[in-house]
C-alpha cells in the first residue's frame, strides 16, 4: 500500500525548491525498480516528484490566500513490467498560513449620526475589519480595535469595533467629529499588522438651547392715527438650535398692556408687535410692555435647558398726529320760535382741537341763508323763520382749525322751528251754496269746516259766529257743532229771487290759541226758483249753478 504523512507547505517561501515530504509504496525495497509519477493541477509546475525516491518538492512560492490546498494524484509503476504497483491514489497538500495580510475595513466610508448631548455609552456605529489570513491559524486573523483619534468623546470596544460616546458633545460647539480607528491582527502582539479607517460622526440637533432676545430693550413708535391691527415693529430672539427646535412663539407677559399684542411670524421667527386698541397721544403718549419668547415644542427631558423664558422690554412711543377738531356732541338739536327777529339766538356748538397745541377753531354752517354762526360757535337767525314754510332745518356745522385749515370736522345740526299762533283759522274750502225761494225757516243749507295752518299742542278748537251786522240783520243763522264744524240755517220763511238774488254772509272763525286769532270768511248764498219738489228751477247766474252741479231741467 501507499505510505505518506500529511503534506504541508508554508506560503510565501522564497527558496527555489522546498521539500514537502515523501510518497512511497511499501513494496518498494529501495532498489530503484519503481518509478513515481505526479498528476493533477500543479503537478510539474508547482510541485515535482523525484521519480526514484517519491520525494515531493514545491518549486514555486505559494500564497495561501490565493489557494490553500492542492489535490494531486500519485502513481507508482514497476519499471520492468510497466505495470502499476499500487492503484492510483489521491493526496492533499495544504498551504500553511503566515501573517502576511493586514486587516482591511471593507465598508468604508463610515458615517454616523448621533444626537448631541447623548449620554456616555450611547452606541454610535460598529466598524468591522477583515483579515485575509487563516483565522484557524494562531492569531494571524485575530483583531483588536483601538482609537487613534477621537478622545475624549469616543471609545471603541477592542474586540467588536463598536464605537460609543464617552463624553457628552454639544452640537453648537462642534457639529461633526472625525474618528480614526485602527485594527491590529495578532491581537496586538509584536509583529502585528494594522489597518485604519476614518469615521465621520455628525451630531444631530436636540432642543438644548432656549431662544434669547438679542436686545434687552426695543424702541418702537406708533402713530395715534394707526388703525387696530397695524404692525408697529418686529422683535427678534435667537435660538442656536436648528429646524423645528428653533421654532419659537412670542407673547406679552400677563397683566401687561391690553393695547398691544405680539404675533409670531413662523417663517422668519420674528415677533410682530400689533396694535390691539387705538392709541391717543393726548391721553397716553408712551407705553411699556414686556415680551417673552419660548420654543414651540420642548420635550420633557430637555426642560432643564428651558427653565426661564427670555424676556425683553419694549418701549412704544405714540407719535402725535394733527387731528381734526372734536365736537362736544355727535350732533346738536336746537329749537327756535318762528317769527323771532333777525339775529335771534338759536344755540351754541363747541369743538376743540384734541392736539396739545389747542388751535383756535372757526365754525361755518354749510349752505344756509337762514342761520349764522360766529367764532364762538353761537348760532343766530339771519332771517325771520316761518314754521308753516319750514318746521325743521337739517344743516351741517363745520369746525376748522385756524392753524391748519385742512383739519376739518363736520356734524349734523337740527333746528326745530317752534310754532307761534300766527295764523287764524279759515274755511277749509271755498263755500258757495243756494237757498230756495220757498225755503222755510230753520232749514239747513250748508255745513262748513275750518282749518288752521298753525301747529297745535292740543287739538285745534274753532269757534264759529256770524259777524255783528249779520247777527243783527240776517236772513240766516249759524250753529257751532263744537266739533270744528258749523251749520248755516235759514232764519226766515221765503226768499225773492228778483228782489235779492244773492246773500253774502260774513262768518267769524276763532281758534283756541293764546292769544286767539279770528278770521272773517264770506259764504255766498244764491236764491233759486225751486219746484214743489224742491228741485232747482231757475237761479241767476245759471252757468254758476250748472257749474255747481245743481240739477236743472
Amino acid at each position: 500500500g501507499w505510505v505518506w504523512n500529511q503534506f504541508f507547505v508554508p506560503e510565501e517561501m522564497n527558496t527555489t525548491s522546498h521539500h514537502i515530504g515523501q510518497l512511497r509504496s511499501d513494496l518498494d525495497n529501495g532498489n530503484n525498480s519503481f518509478q513515481y509519477k505526479l498528476l493533477g493541477a500543479g503537478a510539474g509546475s508547482t510541485f515535482i516528484i523525484d521519480e526514484r525516491t517519491g520525494d515531493i518538492y514545491a518549486i514555486q512560492k505559494l500564497d495561501r490566500e490565493e489557494r490553500s490546498l492542492y489535490i494531486l494524484r500519485a502513481q507508482v509503476i514497476d519499471i520492468a513490467t510497466g505495470r502499476a504497483v499500487e492503484p492510483e491514489s489521491e493526496f492533499v497538500i495544504k498551504v500553511s498560513d503566515i501573517n502576511d495580510n493586514e486587516p482591511k475595513f471593507l465598508d468604508e466610508p463610515y458615517e454616523a449620526i448621533v444626537p448631541e448631548m447623548s449620554p456616555e455609552g450611547t452606541l454610535v456605529i460598529q466598524v468591522t475589519a477583515s483579515d485575509a489570513d487563516d483565522p484557524s491559524s494562531g492569531n494571524n486573523a485575530r483583531l483588536l480595535y483601538s482609537l487613534l483619534q477621537g478622545q475624549p468623546y469616543f471609545s471603541v470596544e477592542p474586540t467588536t469595533g463598536v464605537i460609543r460616546i464617552s463624553s457628552k458633545m454639544d452640537r453648537e460647539l462642534q457639529d461633526e467629529y472625525w474618528v480614526i480607528i485602527q485594527a491590529k491582527d495578532m491581537i496586538g502582539q509584536p509583529g502585528a499588522l494594522s489597518g485604519t479607517t476614518s469615521v465621520l460622526i455628525k451630531l444631530s440637533d436636540v432642543n438644548d438651547n432656549k431662544p434669547i432676545f438679542k436686545e434687552s430693550l426695543y424702541r418702537l413708535t406708533v402713530s395715534e392715527s394707526a388703525p387696530t391691527g397695524t404692525s408697529i415693529g418686529t422683535i427678534m430672539a435667537y435660538d442656536n438650535d436648528i429646524g423645528e427646535n428653533a421654532e419659537m412663539d412670542y407673547s406679552i407677559e400677563e397683566d401687561d398692556s391690553q393695547t398691544f399684542d405680539i404675533i409670531t411670524n413662523h417663517e422668519t421667527q420674528e415677533g410682530i408687535v400689533i396694535l390691539k386698541k387705538k392709541v391717543d397721544f393726548e391721553h397716553q403718549n408712551h407705553y411699556g410692555i414686556r415680551a417673552k419668547v419660548k420654543n414651540h415644542h420642548v420635550p420633557e427631558q430637555l426642560m432643564k435647558y428651558h427653565t426661564e423664558a427670555s424676556t425683553t422690554f419694549i418701549k412704544i412711543q405714540v407719535e402725535d398726529v394733527d387731528e381734526p377738531p372734536l365736537f362736544l356732541l355727535p350732533y346738536y338739536v336746537f329749537e327756535v320760535f318762528e317769527e323771532t327777529p333777525q339775529g335771534s339766538f338759536v344755540g351754541v356748538v363747541s369743538a376743540t382741537d384734541p392736539d396739545n397745541r389747542k388751535s383756535p377753531i372757526r365754525y361755518s354752517i354749510t349752505r344756509s341763508k337762514v342761520f349764522n354762526i360766529n367764532d364762538n360757535g353761537t348760532i343766530t337767525t339771519s332771517n325771520s323763520l316761518d314754521r308753516e314754510i319750514s318746521a325743521w332745518y337739517n344743516l351741517s356745522i363745520t369746525a376748522t382749525e385756524k392753524y391748519n385749515i385742512e383739519q376739518i370736522s363736520s356734524i349734523p345740526l337740527y333746528v326745530q322751528v317752534l310754532n307761534i299762533n300766527d295764523h287764524a283759522p279759515e274755511f277749509s274750502q271755498y263755500y258757495e251754496t243756494y237757498v230756495c225761494e220757498n225755503a222755510g225757516s230753520g232749514q239747513v243749507i250748508q255745513t262748513i269746516s275750518a282749518v288752521d295752518r298753525d301747529e297745535s299742542i292740543e287739538e285745534h278748537h274753532f269757534y264759529f259766529n256770524l259777524s255783528v251786522e249779520d247777527t243783527n240783520n240776517s236772513s240766516f243763522t249759524i250753529i257751532d257743532n263744537q266739533d270744528n264744524t258749523a251749520v248755516i240755517l235759514t232764519n226766515r220763511t221765503g226768499f225773492n229771487l228778483q228782489e235779492e238774488p244773492v246773500f253774502y254772509i260774513s262768518i267769524l272763525i276763532a281758534d283756541n290759541g293764546i292769544p286767539s286769532l279770528t278770521s272773517t270768511n264770506t259764504l255766498t248764498i244764491h236764491v233759486c226758483d225751486c219746484g214743489d219738489s224742491g228741485s232747482t228751477q231757475t237761479c241767476q247766474y245759471q252757468e254758476l249753478v250748472l257749474s255747481m252741479g245743481f240739477k236743472t231741467e
Epitope: 454639544d170 453648537e172 462642534q174 438651547n209 438679542k214 436686545e215 435647558y305 427653565t307
Partner: antibody, heavy 125, light 105 residues
Framework: QVQLVESGGGVVQPGGSLRLSCAAS????????MHWVRQAPGKGLEWVAF????????YYADSVKDRFTISRDNSKNTLYLQMKSLRAEDTAVYYC??????????????????WGQGTTVTVSS | YELTQPPSVSVSPGQTASITCSGD??????VSWYQQKPGQSPILVIY???KWPSGIPERFSGSNSGNTATLTISGTQAMDEADYYC?????????FGGGTKLTVL
C-alpha cells in the same frame, strides 16, 4: 494643540498707542469669533471687545469705545487690538480668548473656551 | 448690566462650595463660569448655565433661576482654591461678575 499667544504689550505713556497681537494655532481660526478681555492688577476680568469669525461685526465695551479697534487677519491666523489715547486705567493684562460655538450660532452663551497666557500693558508717565 | 458676586467663600475639603452670581432677570440669560488660579489664565468650567466643557470634572455644576446663578463644587479639593467669575451676555456685550475668591480651609 489648540493655542493662543498674545504679544505686543509694554509700557506706554498716557495718550499713547499700542497694538496687541494674538497668534492662533491648532484650530481653524477663521471659524471662530474672538474676544479681548483684560484684568487690571488685583482686579477682576473685564471684557474689552469681540469680533465675528469673518470680521464683519465688532462690539466694544463702553470704556474703550472709539479708542480701541479690534481686527483680524484670517490668512495669518492673527487677532489684533489697536489701542490709542491710552489712559492709566487701561493698565492691565490683556488676554485674547476664543468664543466657543460653531459658525451660525449667535451670542456668547457657550463661554470662552480657549485663553492665551496674556500680555501686560502698563500706561504710566 | 451688572453681575454681583460675593468677594469670598470658604469651604472645608470634601464639603460643597456654592458661589452665587446675581443680576436682574439673570435666569432668563445663559451664564458661564471661569476658574482662575494665581498667575494663570482663566479656564471655562461651566457654560450655558449647567453644561460641562470637555475635561471639566462633574463635581462642578451650575444652575440659574430668577435673579441668581449658582456654581456648586461638590467634594471640594485643595486644587479648587481659585478665583471664580460668572459671565453673561446682554445686548451684544459681555459682562463679568466681580469675582469670588474660594478658599479651601
Amino acid at each position: 494643540q489648540v493655542q493662543l499667544v498674545e504679544s505686543g504689550g509694554g509700557v506706554v505713556q498716557p495718550g499713547g498707542s499700542l497694538r496687541l497681537s494674538c497668534a492662533a494655532s491648532g484650530f481653524t481660526f477663521s471659524s471662530y469669533g474672538m474676544h479681548w478681555v483684560r484684568q487690571a492688577p488685583g482686579k477682576g476680568l473685564e471684557w474689552v471687545a469681540f469680533i465675528w469669525y469673518d470680521g464683519s461685526n465688532k462690539y466694544y465695551a463702553d470704556s474703550v469705545k472709539d479708542r480701541f479697534t479690534i481686527s483680524r487677519d484670517n490668512s495669518k491666523n492673527t487677532l489684533y487690538l489697536q489701542m490709542k489715547s491710552l489712559r492709566a486705567e487701561d493698565t492691565a493684562v490683556y488676554y485674547c480668548a476664543r468664543r466657543a460655538g460653531i459658525i451660525g450660532t449667535i451670542g456668547y452663551y457657550y463661554g470662552m473656551d480657549v485663553w492665551g497666557q496674556g500680555t501686560t500693558v502698563t500706561v504710566s508717565s | 448690566y451688572e453681575l454681583t458676586q460675593p468677594p469670598s467663600v470658604s469651604v472645608s475639603p470634601g464639603q460643597t462650595a456654592s458661589i452665587t452670581c446675581s443680576g436682574d432677570r439673570l435666569g432668563e440669560k445663559y451664564v458661564s463660569w471661569y476658574q482662575q488660579k494665581p498667575g494663570q489664565s482663566p479656564i471655562l468650567v461651566i457654560y450655558q448655565d449647567n453644561k460641562w466643557p470637555s475635561g471639566i470634572p462633574e463635581r462642578f455644576s451650575g444652575s440659574n433661576s430668577g435673579n441668581t446663578a449658582t456654581l456648586t463644587i461638590s467634594g471640594t479639593q485643595a486644587m479648587d482654591e481659585a478665583d471664580y467669575y460668572c459671565q453673561a451676555w446682554d445686548s451684544s456685550t459681555v459682562v463679568f461678575g466681580g469675582g469670588t475668591k474660594l478658599t479651601v480651609l
